[in-house]
């Protein structure tokens, strides 16, 4: 005999919620695996200028993305299948996973906040290296792609520490076209924008983390309520 009424509503809510979560995990895992194995983008992981490799942050980043996608698919499956099968065992495992993930998120948040300056420094270093590679070896399309992604995402171009040769290339080739950045190159310093992202815009990352945490707590409550509902319905 299955659950009824409000508990049935929770069951399908949990199913839909986790199905979306499972799909999102699949997308992240797919993109991460594509990034890892596509020849054009694989080079980004090993981008280096002379003897200076890309910061570890980026090398590890892809693997973190793969892990996040896999965990999301696994947890999504547990929630999805556990809800539809009304399995206390699967829902219990799902709840435990959420508790662990919640703890991981809190730990990651604290680590990120403590190390935000180092992360910002790594990001700036990576940008500089990609930019240097794009100028010296202009056949390095991967480096150009990185530079253009930075410019378009952060709406910036170059930095005040660049050589005149790099500035020439930026003005003519790598700055976002049609923007006032070209005529006023250093008003939109990418180093400054990266710093702003990790300091001035840190609250946005915080809000996103809080939203995720709230969703997790919400899912924990729903899974526990459903688990109790299943236990109660099996008694009668």
């Amino acid at each position: 005999m299955g659950v009824e009424g409000c508990t049935k509503c929770i069951k399908y809510l949990l199913f839909v919620f986790n199905f979306v979560f499972w799909l999102a995990g699949g997308v992240i895992l797919g993109v991460a695996l594509w990034l890892r194995h596509d020849p054009q983008t694989t080079n980004l992981l090993y981008l280096e200028l002379g003897d200076k490799p890309a910061p570890n942050t980026f090398y590890v980043g892809i693997y973190i993305l793969i892990a996040v996608g896999a965990v999301m698919m696994f947890v999504g499956f547990l929630g999805c299948y556990g809800a539809i099968q009304e399995s206390q065992c699967l829902l219990g495992t799902f709840f435990t996973c959420l508790v662990i993930l919640f703890a991981c998120e809190v730990a990651a948040g604290i680590w990120g906040f403590v190390n935000k300056d180092q992360i910002a420094k790594d990001v700036k270093q990576f940008y500089d290296q990609a930019l240097q590679q794009a100028v010296v070896d202009d056949d390095a399309n991967n480096a150009k792609a990185v530079v253009k992604t930075f410019h378009e995402t952060l709406d910036c171009c170059g930095s005040s520490t660049l050589s005149a040769l790099t500035t020439s290339v930026l003005k003519n080739n790598l700055c976002p076209s049609g923007s006032n950045i070209i005529s006023n190159l250093f008003k939109e310093d990418c180093h400054q924008k990266i710093d702003d992202l990790f300091s001035g815009k840190l609250y946005l990352i915080g809000i996103a983390a809080i939203v995720v945490a709230v969703i997790m707590i919400f899912e924990m409550i729903l899974s526990m309520v459903l688990c109790c509902g299943i236990r109660n319905s099996s008694v009668y």
Partner: antibody, heavy 123, light 110 residues
Framework: EVQLLESGGGLVQPGGSLRLSCAAS????????MSWVRQVPGKGLEWVSS????????YYADSVKGRFTISRDNSKNTLYLQMNSLRAEDTAVYYC????????????????WGQGTLVTVSS | QSVLTQPPSASGTPGQRVTISCSGS????????VNWYQQLPGTAPKLLIY???NRPSGVPDRFSGSKSGTTASLAISGLRSEDEADYYC??????????FGGGTKLTVLG
Amino acid sequence: EVQLLESGGGLVQPGGSLRLSCAASGFTLGSYWMSWVRQVPGKGLEWVSSISSSSSYIYYADSVKGRFTISRDNSKNTLYLQMNSLRAEDTAVYYCARQRIGDLVVHYGLDVWGQGTLVTVSS
Amino acid sequence: QSVLTQPPSASGTPGQRVTISCSGSSSNLGSNTVNWYQQLPGTAPKLLIYGNSNRPSGVPDRFSGSKSGTTASLAISGLRSEDEADYYCEVWDSDSYVTFGGGTKLTVLG
């Protein structure tokens, strides 16, 4: 030995065209930015054009923009300068030179030069 | 008219120390590294100093370069007759690209 050898110079009438070549030996042309510099006999040096290692970035002096075209064929280890609509003031010795780029993409000058080829524009 | 200004001529006697100046503006010399070339009569230019003060291999240590603000200097100590040549300063400027000075003709007297 690292060398650059220009060819293709000569006498041409105003409005005419000429194509200069610069053959590199002793190094891989495709790894370097390259430039053309000219010098009117008895006068100073004037930069004409520069091209990046894979031709993505190209720059010209205002005096030749729209008339001259720099290009390269890395497989042939050769640099070119196509000169159209030539004027009397384009008369000069044309040098090709290898560009030296240092750490942090700083321009460290032109470290290898050819012997030059004379272009005379006269009717 | 070059945006990098050099004296048209300079002279000195063998063994003497001679300095050639190159002055520009904050947008060219002030914010970029300077390079120096030597052009012996009837030959192609040769890179003498790069990045303000570095000597390529094969260039004697009698030649030295320096830069302060918007002025660069090339110093030749222990002047020799074979140093008689034209000397050019040069920078890469982000707007006008490669820019040469007008050149200085160095004469070794006696």
